[in-house]
């Protein structure tokens, strides 16, 4: 057993049926010593008296709030929360498994540049009694400091018969240098209770690999006289670091028809200009990324042709 | 990712065309490490990562964009001295602070490429004949170190009587590997900035 | 005491369908995760599916996904492995499993896919 | 489709210590507990150790399990005419979690 926050306890269990579970000694927060009476969650039935109260906790019926009372007045609250661990791995079943980049993967993080400033996300299908909590560190032994804002419900989707609920965080490294080589990982630890049931998730990454530029901007179209062609010009997005000479990106111009089968052509390019044909009814479509380190791509910037 | 390989213009840089070729380079090999080792923990999330510049050189502070100098983050700098008669710069736009980035990334290759020859030896000597280091590497580093042109002690080549311990040399090959491409990632930066300056 | 019950195992013919059923009695039932594991005659175990607890997870062995069906009815306190499709390499002991660190199995039931 | 490697069978006469080995792989008995189960003909495998090297109450101490980096092993001290029967190790896969990866069984023949 140990404290999550001040009055709020997880009893870490190892889950399997017929488990003998775990003993838990509660003490009641009061200098008085006769008395005492205690009670779980809004049942009035006594479970025990005196300053302590000893418990087998085997199942959800074991958890919750435990309040010990003197005389109708109530003296101290514990909440206990249940963690369970299945054949030796702790459970997941709050998150779901977003199965991208690879299976097991329930937080999902991007940065738009290298400022150390990220957001993370991730989903459930739970609607209520839900909390998390985020913490995050450069490196785990010695850990450098990363502050995380508070995580909100940032999107509903409707999947199939389920609803399914994104939410997300952003964290910025206290001390980031963009052009730093990083050595140790970020580390982001999400704890998540629902009901009276407790799980943490992690992430591990180098800001590097979870770069993901913002679409270019003001794409526009220049036809060229006499000519089916146009040159195609944009610029760095807005949040990307600089300077552009050393953060440099690289960019993808693609001509797609309105038909998605019809044949893209693809134009690769370090400049912020490009020479393409443009075809009736088509468009133009240039997404981004950093030259040097292949991270993500950004989301295409697209115009029509016409 | 196939990227369209860039021919420098006569004016260009000198350096910048050297510079994309030993990302490529080295992006290549470790692409091939992770490959050929996939029984060995190779990928980024398993490796410890070290850096054999440590303490030596301080490419990353020497090199930092004039931008990026009023970050304080970025200037935890490592006193370093350095040689500073490089060729990379037309003269007149030869500063000290890019001299000593420059000479910095040349001491950088040069223990990169004696840790690789001296690993090369290694794994020339595995009955198993798992993997090399791609020639075609070892060469695009002397080439960026000859155009750098810095007058330095040739370090020699680390030797080692006692018999090699192949898995540990193939794991120390990764670990080399992914430091080396993200120093590889850092001189290409600055090689961009150098030109566009 | 965890006690796991089969039925439903029997000869059928390839293409055909079978249900095997897994009655649980002695534990809370609708608390933990369940398995369907099998073994061809002279052969080594396999699993073939995975349930969590509230039915909201469902996982599949390659050889089966598309065909078989894995659900539990917490009401009933049963597991259920619905067999589509059969084939004769489908031809094994099936036994019901819990999941966790100390696990309880089924009698294990047979089924012959033969024409 | 066997990813846990065991030998196809090993013997012993009564007394003799007798060793089983499961080899596996870094995403697999490198990140994940290791389970052993013993079989008799014609019945369901019964747990005989869990979490590399714990056993269950009811399990007799001359059964004992260990795990080393990605791999594992079963030993019986002094093995006895009753132990002759089928044994197969378990664990997981980092990516494939929930499903049960099995060894491909070892059939223990107890001589004389």
């Known amino acids: 057993i140990w404290e999550l926050k001040k009055d709020v306890y997880v009893v870490e269990l190892d889950w399997y049926p017929d488990a003998p579970g775990e003993m838990v000694v509660l003490t009641c927060d009061t200098p008085e010593e006769d008395g005492i009476t205690w009670t779980l969650d809004q049942s009035s039935e006594v479970l025990g008296s005196g300053k302590t109260l000893t418990i087998q906790v085997k199942e959800f019926g074991d958890a919750g709030q435990y309040t010990c009372h003197k005389g109708g007045e109530v003296l101290s609250h514990s909440l206990l929360l249940l963690h369970k661990k299945e054949d030796g791995i702790w459970s997941t079943d709050i998150l779901k498994d977003q199965k991208e980049p690879k299976n097991k993967t329930f937080l999902r993080c991007e940065a738009k540049n290298y400022s150390g400033r990220f957001t993370c996300w991730w989903l459930t299908t739970i609607s209520t009694d839900l909390t998390f909590s985020v913490k995050s560190s450069r490196g785990s032994s010695d850990p450098q400091g990363v502050t995380c804002g508070a995580a909100t419900l940032s999107a509903e989707r409707v999947r199939g018969d389920n609803k399914e609920y994104e939410y997300s965080v952003e964290c910025q490294e206290d001390s980031a240098c963009p052009a730093a080589e990083e050595s140790l990982p970020i580390e982001v630890m999400v704890d998540a209770v629902h009901k009276l049931k407790y799980e943490n998730y992690t992430s591990s990454f180098f800001i590097r690999d979870i770069i993901k530029p913002d679409p270019p901007k003001n794409l526009q179209l220049k036809p060229l006289k006499n000519s089916r062609q146009v040159e195609v010009s944009w610029e760095y997005p807005d949040t990307w670091s600089t300077p552009h000479s050393y953060f440099s990106l690289t960019f993808c111009v693609q001509v797609q028809g309105k038909s998605k089968r019809e044949k893209k052509d693809r134009v690769f390019t370090d400049k912020t200009s490009a020479t393409v044909i443009c075809r009736k009814n088509a468009s133009i479509s240039v997404r981004a990324q950093d030259r040097y380190y292949s991270s993500s791509w950004s989301e295409w910037a697209s115009v029509p042709c016409s | 990712r196939n990227l369209p390989v860039a021919t420098p213009d006569p004016g260009m840089f000198p350096c910048l065309h050297h510079s994309q070729n030993l990302l490529r380079a080295v992006s290549n090999m470790l692409q091939k490490a992770r490959q050929t080792l996939e029984f060995y923990p190779c990928t980024s999330e398993e490796i410890d990562h070290e850096d054999i510049t440590k303490d030596k050189t301080s490419t990353v502070e020497a090199c930092l964009p004039l931008e990026l100098t009023k970050n304080e983050s970025c200037l935890n700098s490592r006193e370093t001295s350095f040689i500073t008669n490089g060729s990379c710069l037309a003269s007149r736009k030869t500063s000290f602070m890019m001299a000593l980035c420059l000479s910095s990334i040349y001491e950088d290759l040069k223990m990169y490429q004696v840790e690789f020859k001296t690993m090369n030896a290694k794994l020339l000597m595995d009955p198993k004949r798992q993997i090399f280091l791609d020639q075609n590497m070892l060469a695009v580093i002397d080439e960026l170190m000859q155009a750098l042109n810095f007058n330095s002690e040739t370090v020699p080549q680390k030797s080692s009587l006692e018999e090699p311990d192949f898995y540990k040399t193939k794991i120390k090959l990764c670990i080399l590997l992914h430091a080396f491409r993200i120093r590889a990632v850092t001189i290409d930066r600055v090689m961009s900035y150098l030109n566009a300056s | 005491q965890v006690q796991l019950v089969q039925s439903g195992g029997g000869v059928v013919q390839p293409g055909r369908s079978l249900r095997l059923s897994c009655a649980a009695s002695?534990?809370?039932?609708?608390?933990?995760?369940m398995h369907w594991v099998r073994q061809a005659p002279g052969k080594g175990l396999e699993w073939v599916a995975f349930?969590?607890?509230?039915?909201?997870?469902?996982y599949y062995a390659d050889s089966v996904k598309g065909r078989f069906t894995i659900s539990r009815d917490n009401s009933k306190n049963t597991l259920y492995l619905q067999m589509k499709s059969l084939r004769a390499e489908d031809t094994a002991v099936y036994y019901c499993?819990?999941?966790?660190?100390?696990?309880?199995w089924g009698q294990g039931t047979m089924v012959t896919v033969s024409s | 489709s066997y990813v846990l490697t065991q030998p196809p069978s090993v013997s012993g006469t009564p007394g003799q210590r007798v060793t089983i080995s499961c080899s596996g792989g870094r995403s697999n008995i490198g990140k994940n507990t290791v389970k052993w189960y013993q079989q008799l003909p014609g019945t369901a495998p019964k747990l005989l150790i869990y979490g590399n090297d714990q056993r269950p109450s009811g399990v007799p101490d001359r059964f004992s399990g260990s795990k080393s980096g990605t791999s594992a092993s079963l030993a019986i001290t002094g093995v006895q005419a009753e132990d002759e029967a089928d044994y197969y190790c378990q664990s997981y896969d980092r990516g494939t979690h929930p499903a049960l990866l099995f060894g491909t069984g070892t059939k223990v023949t107890v001589l004389g």
């Open positions: 002695g534990f809370t039932f609708s608390s933990y995760g």
């Open positions: 349930i969590r607890y509230d039915g909201s997870n469902k």
């Open positions: 499993k819990t999941h966790g660190s100390h696990d309880n």
